[in-house]
């Protein structure tokens, strides 16, 4: 028989965690698991429990995590990696819409994330969406063009800036930008 199926690993309430705020990492395998192993990759740090409660997020805890479990002498496949990001490490960028935050359905709009610092990575989040749009950019601004806008693009957007040298240490979120599709 082959390896045991991989467990799931999630961060609650979110994998984007403001500094000093709590977060829980939870590894979930089948019932009756003998042992869990939760590890922080590239650090030699681990624990042999399914749940890691972080009472206050710190830079040292940001990074990639994965977990696995053992039943008898068999180990499971590792979970998908979880990227735990500390936010609020740097000052917030500004987010703007060109030509403006009100756009007609079928029109085009570009969301621009701008920072005073030399960050080369930007992430754009739409409230309610599970994953960000990421955009590497050589300069101090990142453009996120939205071609042929539909009603589904309406909503609240925020962006973050960070450096590819420390990809899990992000800025505070920009002030929210409300995109209105008419």
């Amino acid at each position: 028989s082959g390896p045991l199926p991989k467990p799931s690993l999630q961060a609650l309430p979110s994998s984007l965690v403001p500094l000093e705020k709590p977060v829980t990492l939870r590894c979930q395998g089948p019932p009756g698991v003998d042992l869990y192993r939760l590890e922080k990759l590239s650090s030699s740090r681990y624990q042999d429990q399914a749940v890691l409660f972080i009472p206050a997020m710190k830079r040292s805890l940001a990074g990639r995590y994965r977990c696995s479990y053992q039943n008898g002498s068999l180990w499971s496949l590792p979970s998908d990696q979880l990227e735990l990001v500390a936010t609020g490490v740097f000052a917030k960028p500004s987010l703007s819409a060109q030509p403006g935050p009100a756009v007609s359905s079928g029109g085009d709009v570009t969301l621009q994330c701008q920072t005073r610092y030399g960050f080369d990575q930007f992430a754009l989040y739409k409230e309610g969406d599970p994953a960000p749009y990421k955009n590497p950019e050589r300069w101090y601004r990142a453009s996120f063009p939205i071609i042929t806008v539909t009603a589904a693009h309406s909503g609240t957007y925020r962006c973050y800036s960070f450096s590819s040298r420390d990809p899990y240490l992000w800025s505070a979120p920009s002030d929210p930008l409300e995109l209105v599709v008419t």
Partner: nanobody
């Protein structure tokens, strides 16, 4: 709110002893590794000793303090201690208590300050000759 509060520092004559204490709150104390570091102005923070809960409380001490300093912990009281004997002027520094939420699997990992998540404000130890 996670808090580590050191106490017990002070001025002592060379050859004397001090006992540092660190009170921890807000962390799952019995699953954490606890350590002492020290720092002299203008220098890197230096590992002194660590005690973890794995294998019944494994300890490790920096070579410079082995045989003179001893780390211990009281899980019931959420305290960690550093008993310092045969002090010499080179031990003069600010001493910091640190806590790690995770264990280390590699040699030297516990001596790396990046392996610790929470830090106290420090207590000054001055050894006069």
């Amino acid at each position: 709110q996670v808090q580590l509060q050191e106490s017990g520092g002070g001025l002592v004559q060379a050859g004397g002893s001090l006992r540092l204490s660190c009170a921890a709150s807000g962390v799952t104390f019995d699953s954490a590794a606890m350590a002492w570091f020290r720092q002299v102005p203008g220098k890197e923070r230096e590992f002194v000793a660590v005690i973890s809960t794995e294998s019944g409380g494994r300890t490790d001490h920096a070579d410079s303090v082995k045989g003179r300093f001893l780390i211990s912990r009281d899980n019931a009281r959420h305290m960690v201690y550093l008993q310092m004997n045969s002090l010499n002027p080179e031990d003069t520094a600010v001493y910091y208590c640190a806590s790690s939420l995770l264990y280390c699997s590699a040699s030297g990992c516990y001596a790396n300050r990046d392996s610790y998540d929470y830090w106290g404000q420090g207590t000054q130890v001055t050894v006069s000759s």
